[in-house]
C-alpha cells in the first residue's frame, strides 16, 4: 500500500521520499534520539527509518461508525445506521518517558491509542468514559497538543489538548488537560487532571455562543511549551466582525492562548489576538508556527539571550477564508519575551480593576476586572477571579518575508553556527530556505536564498520537521513525505557561485575545490583553506 522511497526534487540529486497513494497523510513526528519518523494518516500510522524506508504500518481504520453515535457503537448500541468510516489521525505525539506514541483519531468520537514505538503494537484501549472522547471532527490540521512529562520519579504526565468541536459543546471541551498514566489500561487514563463541582481542567464553548454563532469554533494550529507555560496558536470565528446571520460572510481571528503548565483549574487562561502587518497589509490568518532559539546573531539583534525562545509564524493575508486562505502570506517573528510582557501588562491592568475581561465568546457578558492587592509577576498563574482574560490589543510580530504568489503553509527553523535559518513550505509543494538577519543591507530582515521542490503542486502540510542531526528536513504533503537536505552546497561549482548563493551552510573548500559545509572540508580551520565570504574568493 505504501510506495518505496523514490526520486524527487529538481536539479539536485534525488530526494528520498515515502509515498502513501491510498491514504492521505496528516501528521509527522521524528524521534529525537533514533531519528525514526512516525507518520499519521487516514486509517494508518506508519513507522519509517530516517531515510524513509517503511518499517511498520499500523491499521486504525476504516471502522463501523457513525459520528451521531455517542458514545460510539462499540460501547453502546446506537439508533443511527453504521457505515464504514475513515479514521483520520489528528494528533501524533511522542511520549519519550513511556516509550510510546500517542495517536488520536476522528473515529469513535475521537479516541486516542497508545502504540509501542518499537513495533506500533497497540498498548491497551481507553475505557470509554466520556473524557476519553476528544472530538469527532475529521479535519486533520485543527487539533494540537502538548505532552508534559511528569517530574522524574514522581508525578504523572499530562496532555494539554485543543480541538474544534463542531457545535458539540455538551460532548467535547475545546481545551483540556488530561492525565496520562504509565499503565495504558488504567481507568484514569485521559481523565481531567482536576475536576470538582465548580472548576475542572477544561474549557467548553458555551451553548449561548453556539446559539448566537452556530459556526463558532476554535481551530488549533500549533502548540508548544515555553518555560512554565503552554501556548496555542488558534484560529477562531471573529464574533465582533461576523454577523450572527448564518448566510453572512465569516471572518476569523488568530489568537495566542496561554495556560500555566501547573494550573489544573485553568485560572491562568489568557488569549490575545495575534498577527503581523507590513506596508499597510494585515496578515491575520495563522497558518503555522515553529518555536526556536534565535541563534547568536539574531539574539544579539533582538537584545535576547541565546537560550530565549522565539516564535516563527506564517500568516495569510486578511481575515477571511480559513479553509482556502489568500495566497499572499507573511513569515513573521515574535519573541516570547515580548509576548509574556504584553500578557503580564494586561493581567496587571486587570488586577488594578481597569477595564473588562474582554472574552465575549467564552463569558457571554462584559465582566469587569476586579481590583486586588495580589502581586502579578512573570510567573503569575491566575486566581479564581479576573479570569479567563482576553487581550484587547493585537500582539504584532516583526514581518520578515512576504510571499505574494505561492502562499506559505508551513515553517521550521534552526540555528546553524550562530545564524538563523528558516524553512517555509508553500502551497505549490516547494521549500523556501530563508536566512534571517535583521542587519541585512537594504533593511531586508530576511533573505530567501533557495527554493527546492518537495512535491510539485501539492501543498506542504504543517509538520515540517528537522532530523535530529539537522542534516535533513522532512516535508509532508497529503500523499508523500520528502527528505530534503538542509543544504545542497555541492550544486555550486565555483567559489563565486558558492558564496554568492548566500546559503549560510556553504563555503568554498580550497583543498578539493568544492562548495561544502565547513565540517565537511578538510583543514577548514587553517588559514586560506575555507572561504566563507565572497571577498575571500578574489584573494584565493
Amino acid at each position: 500500500e505504501a510506495g518505496l522511497p523514490r526520486a524527487g526534487g529538481g536539479s539536485q540529486p534525488p530526494f528520498r521520499t515515502f509515498s502513501a497513494s491510498d491514504w492521505g497523510l496528516t501528521h509527522l513526528v521524528v524521534h529525537e534520539q533514533t531519528g525514526e519518523v512516525y507518520v499519521g494518516a487516514v486509517n494508518r500510522i506508519y513507522k519509517l527509518s530516517g531515510n524513509l524506508t517503511l518499517l511498520r504500518a499500523h491499521v486504525t481504520g476504516p471502522v463501523e461508525d457513525n459520528e451521531k453515535c455517542y458514545p460510539p457503537p462499540s460501547v453502546q448500541s446506537c439508533p443511527h445506521g453504521l457505515g464504514s468510516t475513515d479514521n483520520v489521525n489528528k494528533l501524533l505525539l511522542l511520549d519519550y518517558a513511556a516509550n510510546r506514541l500517542l495517536a488520536c483519531g476522528s473515529a469513535s468520537q475521537g479516541i486516542c491509542q497508545f502504540l509501542r514505538l518499537d513495533d506500533l503494537f497497540k498498548l491497551g484501549e481507553p475505557h470509554h468514559r466520556k473524557e476519553h472522547y476528544l472530538s469527532s471532527v475529521q479535519e486533520a490540521g485543527s487539533m494540537a497538543g502538548v505532552l508534559i512529562a511528569g517530574p522524574p520519579g514522581q508525578g504523572q504526565a499530562k496532555l494539554f489538548v485543543g480541538t474544534p468541536i463542531d457545535g458539540k459543546s455538551e460532548y467535547f471541551p475545546t481545551l483540556s488537560s488530561r492525565r496520562l498514566m504509565a499503565n495504558e489500561e488504567d481507568a484514569d487514563m485521559f481523565g481531567f487532571v482536576y475536576q470538582d463541582e465548580f472548576v475542572s481542567s477544561q474549557l467548553k464553548i458555551p451553548s449561548d455562543t453556539l446559539s448566537k454563532f452556530p459556526a463558532f469554533d476554535i481551530y488549533y494550529v500549533y502548540s508548544f511549551r515555553s518555560e512554565q507555560f503552554v501556548y496555542y496558536l488558534t484560529l477562531q470565528l471573529d464574533t465582533q466582525l461576523t454577523s450572527p446571520d448564518a448566510a453572512g460572510e465569516h471572518f476569523f481571528t488568530s489568537k495566542i492562548v496561554r495556560l500555566c503548565v501547573d494550573d489544573p483549574k485553568f485560572y491562568s487562561y489568557v488569549e490575545f489576538p495575534i498577527g503581523c502587518e507590513q506596508a499597510g497589509v494585515e496578515y491575520r490568518l495563522v497558518q503555522d508556527a515553529y518555536l526556536s532559539r534565535p541563534g547568536r546573531a539574531l539574539a544579539h539583534q533582538l537584545g535576547l539571550a541565546e537560550d530565549e525562545d522565539v516564535l516563527f509564524t506564517v500568516f495569510a493575508q486578511g481575515q477571511k477564508n480559513r479553509v482556502k486562505p489568500p495566497k499572499e502570506s507573511a513569515l513573521c517573528l515574535f519573541t516570547l519575551r515580548a509576548i509574556k510582557e504584553k500578557i503580564k501588562e494586561r493581567i496587571q491592568s486587570c488586577y488594578r480593576g481597569e477595564g473588562k475581561l474582554s472574552l465575549p465568546w467564552l463569558l457571554n457578558k462584559e465582566l469587569g476586572c476586579i481590583n486586588s492587592p495580589l502581586q502579578i509577576d512573570d510567573d503569575f498563574c491566575g486566581q479564581d477571579f479576573n479570569q479567563p482574560l482576553g487581550g484587547t490589543v493585537t500582539i504584532e510580530g516583526t514581518p520578515l518575508f512576504v510571499d505574494k504568489d505561492d502562499g506559505l503553509t508551513a515553517v521550521a527553523a534552526y540555528d546553524y553556527r550562530g545564524r538563523t535559518v528558516v524553512f517555509a513550505g508553500t502551497r505549490s509543494g516547494r521549500i523556501r530556505k530563508i536566512l534571517v538577519d535583521l542587519s541585512n543591507p537594504g533593511g531586508r530582515p530576511a533573505l530567501a536564498y533557495e527554493s527546492v521542490v518537495a512535491q510539485e503542486g501539492s501543498p506542504i502540510l504543517r509538520d515540517l520537521v528537522l532530523s535530529p542531526n539537522h542534516q535533513y528536513l522532512y516535508a509532508m504533503t497529503e500523499k508523500q513525505v520528502t527528505r530534503v537536505p538542509v543544504e545542497s552546497c555541492v550544486q555550486y561549482t565555483s567559489c563565486e557561485l558558492c558564496l554568492g548563493s548566500r546559503d549560510p551552510h556553504c563555503g568554498w573548500c580550497v583543498l578539493h575545490s568544492i562548495c561544502s559545509r565547513r565540517d565537511a572540508c578538510e583543514r577548514a580551520d587553517e588559514p586560506q583553506r575555507f572561504a566563507a565570504d565572497l571577498l575571500q574568493c578574489v584573494q584565493l
Epitope: F198, G353, N371, S372, D384, F385
Partner: antibody, heavy 122, light 106 residues
Framework: QVQLQQSGPGLVKPSQTLSLTCAIS??????????WNWIRQSPSGGLEWLGR?????????DYAVSVKSRITINPDTSKNQFSLQLNSVTPEDTSVYYC????????????WGQGTMVTVSS | SYELTQPPSVSVSPGQTASITCSGD??????ASWYQQRPGQSPLLVIY???KRPSGIPQRFSGSNSGNTATLTISGTQAMDEADYFC?????????FGTGTKVTIL
C-alpha cells in the same frame, strides 16, 4: 464533606470587642481556591458581608467598607481555623454571625457555619 | 455603594412557577448567586454564575441574568420551597447581598 463549626460568646458589652472563631473540617484554610468569610444577619433579616481571608502564596484580607476601621480576620493554620474580631461594638452590631467559605468571587458562598447569635448589650 | 433590590414577598400556589427578581445597576455584567434560607437555618447556595446549580439542588431551580435584572425561577413549587431568598453579586471588592424575598406557598 466540608463543615464549619463556630464558637464564641453570645453576649458582648458595648465598646468591647466581639470575638468569634470558625473551625474548618474537610478542607484546608490554606487552600488556594477558597476564601473564608464572615457574614452577619441583622434581626430584620438582611445579610451583610463583613470580610474574608484567603491564601494565595501569602495571606490576604478583604473587608467591607462599613466595618473596615474596626474589623480583623485572622487565619490560624496550625488549628485550621480563622477568627473574627470586631472592635468598639454597639447595639447595631447585634446579629447572627456566620462564617462561610466561598470558592471564588464568581461561585458564591457554598458552605456556611451554623451561625452564632451575638447580642450587644450592657 | 452598590445595592441589590428584591421584592419583599412573592406568593405562589403549589405546583406553579415562582419568579424572584433582583435589580442592580448593570447587574447583567456581573455574576449573580442566589441563596435559600429556611427559618432557623443557615443560607444555602442554590444558583451561582447566573444559572448554574450546585450538586444536590433540584432542577426546578433556575436562574438568568441580563441588563439590570437577575431572576431566580422555581418551577413546580413545593411546600419545602417556602423560605427567604437572597441574591448576591460581587462589586468593587465586596460581596453585596440583596434585600431578600419571602416566598410563601399558598
Amino acid at each position: 464533606q466540608v463543615q464549619l463549626q463556630q464558637s464564641g460568646p453570645g453576649l458582648v458589652k458595648p465598646s468591647q470587642t466581639l470575638s468569634l472563631t470558625c473551625a474548618i473540617s474537610g478542607d484546608s484554610l490554606s487552600s488556594t481556591s477558597a476564601a473564608w468569610n464572615w457574614i452577619r444577619q441583622s434581626p430584620s433579616g438582611g445579610l451583610e458581608w463583613l470580610g474574608r481571608t484567603y491564601y494565595r502564596s501569602k495571606w490576604y484580607n478583604d473587608y467591607a467598607v462599613s466595618v473596615k476601621s474596626r474589623i480583623t480576620i485572622n487565619p490560624d493554620t496550625s488549628k485550621n481555623q480563622f477568627s473574627l474580631q470586631l472592635n468598639s461594638v454597639t447595639p447595631e452590631d447585634t446579629s447572627v454571625y456566620y462564617c462561610a467559605r466561598d470558592r471564588g468571587y464568581y461561585n458564591g458562598v457554598d458552605v456556611w457555619g451554623q451561625g452564632t447569635m451575638v447580642t450587644v448589650s450592657s | 455603594s452598590y445595592e441589590l433590590t428584591q421584592p419583599p414577598s412573592v406568593s405562589v400556589s403549589p405546583g406553579q412557577t415562582a419568579s424572584i427578581t433582583c435589580s442592580g445597576d448593570k447587574l447583567g455584567d456581573k455574576y449573580a448567586s442566589w441563596y435559600q434560607q429556611r427559618p432557623g437555618q443557615s443560607p444555602l447556595l442554590v444558583i451561582y454564575q447566573d444559572n448554574k446549580r450546585p450538586s444536590g439542588i433540584p432542577q426546578r431551580f433556575s436562574g438568568s441574568n441580563s441588563g439590570n435584572t437577575a431572576t431566580l425561577t422555581i418551577s413546580g413549587t413545593q411546600a419545602m420551597d417556602e423560605a427567604d431568598y437572597f441574591c448576591q453579586a460581587w462589586d468593587s471588592g465586596t460581596f453585596v447581598f440583596g434585600t431578600g424575598t419571602k416566598v410563601t406557598i399558598l
